[in-house]
Amino acid sequence: AQEVQQSPHCTTVPVGASVNITCSTSGGLRGIYLRQLGPQPQDIIYYEDGVVPTTDRRFRGRIDFSGSQDNLTITMHRLQLSDTGTYTCQAITEVNVYGSGTLVLVTEEQSQGWHRCSDAPPRASALPAPPTGSALPDPQTASALPDPPAASALP
């Protein structure tokens, strides 16, 4: 069955830095989206071989592409705190196929201690389990950010 391999699972970067997200499939795509999950999922880019990519205005001028729609690397530049979130690749094929998601944590330098990625992929709730029918629902919920450690009481 068609599937999307997506990497990395999670990445922590300082404000102003760049991040690469790679979406790989076995081919046979019409095109591929990168979408930011949340209460209202938002398209970030749509890429189709031989067609000028479409990019959300929030990221215009901050995104580069390399490869082809079957093996696409998306580079997001000049990251802002508001870019923090879970991004998923979605392949347009006969049925909907989703990547596992990439949690991007954009941090201010001093807070990187607790804004850290674990080795685990984004939590499973970020992508719904497919129903018994052939069409998958739109992914709805984003992975939550890790909770900051509880402040220790002052002496």
Epitope: R30, G31, R35, Q40, D43, Y46, T54, Q90, A135, D138
Partner: nanobody, 122 residues
Framework: AVQLVDSGGGLVQPGGSLGLSCAAS????????MSWYRQAPGKERMLVAT????????NYEDSVKGRFTISRDNARDTVYLQMNSLKPEDTAMYYC???????????????WGQGTQVTVSS
């Protein structure tokens, strides 16, 4: 140029079936929710069925529930309306409609097909 080409209409007897198709070109089909509307002579255009852009959900006007089925193929840029147990009151011009919802890169854009006539009569 953007095009939605509706086809599949015709004359059918009550109780019969018909399948409509709408082939899209000139825009990114998967970025749009797709709907079928119908307009009977002298009446306003009414929504019949809608399917979300990735096919996750569909909705139907009460009078067609259980008889009509909307589906889409994003790999072929086509939306379908399968109509069963047709009644004379289903007679109308049927139009397909594309509308980009919130969250889509093309939010706010919408397009209409030229329509295909369905006549249910004995």
């Amino acid at each position: 140029a953007v095009q939605l080409v509706d086809s599949g209409g015709g004359l059918v007897q009550p109780g019969g079936s018909l399948g409509l198709s709408c082939a899209a070109s000139g825009f990114t089909f998967s970025g749009f929710d797709m709907s079928w509307y119908r307009q009977a002579p002298g009446k306003e255009r009414m929504l019949v069925a809608t399917i979300t852009r990735f096919g996750g959900s569909s909705n139907y006007e009460d009078s067609v529930k259980g008889r009509f089925t909307i589906s889409r193929d994003n790999a072929r840029d086509t939306v379908y309306l399968q109509m069963n147990s047709l009644k004379p009151e289903d007679t109308a011009m049927y139009y397909c409609h594309a509308e980009a919802p919130a969250g889509s890169l093309w939010f706010g854009n919408n397009y209409w097909g030229q329509g295909t006539q369905v006549t249910v009569s004995s």
